[in-house]
Interface confidence: low
């Protein structure tokens, strides 16, 4: 297993609709044709998998139908969007990239993007 550099922004603020987007960029050392991208969430020293997708270079990034993630790829960049976020989902979101094929296998893990999610204030009741 060979190491690979992965870069991602340090901080992202989710929108009022609970959507956060960030770019995950990897320094590809070879002619990868099959790439796997995994988003991990680290909170209170616990790491959980948020979503994962495998894509072939030049093709779309396909997450599972029920995934909270969507994404697009362009060269060595993956544009990731996580939706449905709430304040309790605030945490460090780590981008893990694996060059699955052809060999050799490369693995890169970013330093993480701290996503801050602020639940919108509920609208005050209106009297008509």
């Amino acid at each position: 297993c060979k190491a690979m550099h992965v870069a991602q922004p340090a901080v992202v603020l989710a929108s009022s609709r609970g959507i956060a987007s960030f770019v995950c960029e990897y320094a590809s050392p070879g002619k990868a044709t099959e790439v796997r991208v995994t988003v991990l969430r680290q909170a209170d020293s616990q790491v959980t998998e948020v979503c994962a997708a495998t894509y072939m270079m030049g093709n779309e990034l396909t997450f599972l139908d029920d995934s909270i993630c969507t994404g697009t790829s362009s060269g060595n960049q993956v544009n990731l969007t996580i939706q449905g976020l709430r304040a309790m989902d605030t945490g460090l979101y780590i981008c893990k990239v694996e060059l699955m094929y052809p060999p050799p296998y490369y693995l890169g893990i970013g330093n993480g993007t701290q996503i801050y999610v602020i639940d919108p204030e509920p609208c005050p009741d209106s009297d008509f």
Epitope: E34, T62, P102, P103
Partner: antibody, heavy 122, light 107 residues
């Protein structure tokens, strides 16, 4: 003409290891990946993994990580697969097969070895 | 992992007949599909790749088709040498998996 000549049948004890060989001829060994495939009556054909003879780089089916180790010897154009901690589940016919490098579309497994039968029995 | 479901598991046909074998992938494999023929005690032989391109030396009575998750291999005017086992395999993302096989027997 392209040929992949595999080593002969093996009868091995449970817990032991075995190394299978696949000697390539009729083409430039380093221009193609070497893949290994397992065949049993129960599970059919299963892709084990691949090695790039030029770099020694490997990619494995997660199911066979820790079970199979792929290596090559460029000087003799031979690929090897070591299988360890053998159990009855490893009894199968194992094939080597080549695949063109770096093609993610039209490079497929075009030539196969004749297969090596491995029987694990005490 | 992408699973390949092949059907039928077996079929009997007569020389001269036309048969079709199908393979369904559990996800879109974008035509990254190969078909192999295997005779008893022999190694698999490549028939079709890219879902529809015939490998060198394969007779034109064989044809592959399909897209997305559904693929098929058609054999026109069956010849005695066509009987044996047929397998599909995807090359979309590792691990590359094979279908369970179709045993084509002489009726």
């Amino acid at each position: 003409q392209v040929q992949l000549q595999q080593s002969g049948a093996e009868l091995v004890r449970p817990g032991a290891s075995v190394t299978l060989s696949c000697k390539a001829s009729g083409y430039t060994f380093t221009d193609y990946e070497m893949h290994w495939v397992k065949q049993t009556p129960v599970h059919g054909l299963e892709w084990i993994g691949t090695i790039d003879p030029e770099t020694g780089g490997t990619a494995y089916n997660q199911k066979f990580k820790g079970k199979a180790t792929l290596t090559t010897d460029k000087s003799s154009s031979t690929a090897y697969m070591e299988l360890r901690s053998l159990t009855s589940e490893d009894s199968a016919v194992y094939y080597c097969t080549r695949r063109g490098k770096y093609g993610n579309y039209d490079y497929v497994m075009d030539y196969w070895g004749q297969g090596t039968s491995v029987t694990v029995s005490s | 992992d992408i699973q390949m479901t092949q059907s039928p598991a077996s079929l009997s046909a007569s020389v001269g007949e036309t048969v079709t074998i199908t393979c369904r992938a559990s996800g879109n494999i974008h035509n990254y599909l190969a078909w192999y023929q295997q005779k008893q005690g022999k190694s698999p032989q490549l028939l079709v790749f890219n879902a529809k391109t015939l490998a060198d030396g394969v007779p034109s009575r064989f044809s592959g088709s399909g897209s997305g998750t559904q693929y098929s291999l058609k054999i026109n005017s069956l010849q005695p040498e066509d009987f044996g086992n047929y397998y599909c395999q995807h090359f979309w993302s590792t691990p590359w998996t094979f279908g369970g096989g179709t045993k084509l027997e002489i009726k």
